[in-house]
Interface confidence: medium
């Protein structure tokens, strides 16, 4: 994905810009956007970026707020690229089981699970 | 989702069953399954469960290996439920920005990012 800066730096910069422009972004008090009700963020990337689109369409553009939305679109491109890589390589069952075990291990230790 | 045990316990039990049945599951040496090439597992749940389906259709069923696939199907139901909760509640921009900031924060600290 053609970004001038590495994705990790892009994320950091975007966090800073989000903080800078918060007052401008919350100016529309009637706007309602779907917000996930759990913290397993990666499951909700589609809805998050739809929300960003809604917000962008309601925000007066100009200056560094444009940079914020540009950055967010590059982050989306990065995530879309990662999603493409989910099914690109066919491997032996052994390697699939390693990945499945890793996935369940992460779910076991890192996910916020409400029963 | 009607499971007799909490999801967290279900995940633990499934990890154990996966380990128990590994030899049986890898018996088919010609089978190839798509394996994600990165560690952001939550982005790849669809492909992971498609892979499990491929594996199940090639595995001789019976005994506790059936329990493994049953468990995995309950985990899928849980994740599908979580995905539904991504867009269910409409909130103020303020709350959306909190979630977006949290998402980017997690991406910044926990994601495995290759540029």
């Amino acid at each position: 994905i053609p970004t001038e800066i590495p994705t990790s730096a892009l994320v950091k910069e975007t966090l800073a810009l989000l903080s800078t422009h918060r007052t401008l972004l919350i100016a529309n008090e009637t706007l309602r956007i779907p917000v996930p009700v759990h913290k397993n963020h990666q499951l909700c990337t589609e809805e998050i970026f739809q929300g960003i689109g809604t917000l962008e369409s309601q925000t007066v553009q100009g200056g560094t707020v444009e940079r914020l939305f540009k950055n967010l679109s590059l982050i989306k491109k990065y995530i879309d690229g990662q999603k493409k890589k989910c099914g690109e390589e066919r491997r032996r069952v052994n390697q699939f089981l390693d990945y499945l075990q890793e996935f369940l291990g992460v779910m076991n230790t890192e996910w916020i699970i409400e029963s | 989702i009607p499971t007799e045990i909490p999801t967290s316990a279900l995940v633990k039990e499934t990890l154990a069953l996966l380990s128990t049945h590994r030899t049986l599951l890898i018996a088919n040496e010609t089978l190839r399954i798509p394996v994600p090439v990165h560690k952001n597992h939550q982005l790849c749940t669809e492909e992971i469960f498609q892979g499990i389906g491929t594996l199940e259709s090639q595995t001789v069923q019976g005994g506790t290996v059936e329990r493994l696939f049953k468990n995995l199907s309950l985990i899928k139901k849980y994740i599908d439920g979580q995905k539904k909760k991504c867009g269910e509640e409409r909130r103020r921009v303020n709350q959306f920005l909190d979630y977006l900031q949290e998402f980017l924060g997690v991406m910044n600290t926990e994601w495995i990012i290759e540029s």
Partner: nanobody, 122 residues
């Protein structure tokens, strides 16, 4: 202990009908993909009809339009309604099941009944 027991076979004239039943014990039909197989003397065993865990139904070409597979989850029974029977339908018919939670393809059947004989005379 899983058991599949077939019944309903018998002798019938060409053009007649039979209804085969397969009662399952030790498993619930909600959790399984099922199929009817048949084997005629000196011939390959073939899958006649199948019903997946998600209710998708498939038929072998020679029986399409004549045979109907169904299941009654409450009775834990699968059926095969056979109409317009032909002499070439003569075979031992058996039912088979496998618990599948993800895949609808029935590559491996774990459980199978003893079978019921169907004889069609011309």
């Amino acid at each position: 202990q899983v058991q599949l027991v077939e019944s309903g076979g018998g002798s019938v004239q060409a053009g007649g009908s039979l209804r085969l039943s397969c009662v399952a014990s030790g498993l619930t039909l909600n959790d399984v993909s099922m199929a009817w197989f048949r084997q005629a003397p000196g011939k390959e065993r073939e899958e006649v009809a199948g019903i997946d865990i998600d209710g998708l139904i498939s038929y072998a070409d020679p029986v399409k339009g004549r045979f109907t597979i169904s299941k009654d989850n409450a009775q834990n029974t699968m059926y095969l309604q056979m109409n317009s029977l032909k002499p070439e339908d003569t075979a031992m018919y058996s039912c088979a099941a496998v618990r599948l939670y993800f895949s609808s393809s029935r590559n491996q059947y774990k459980y199978e009944g003893q079978g019921t004989q169907v004889t069609v005379s011309s």
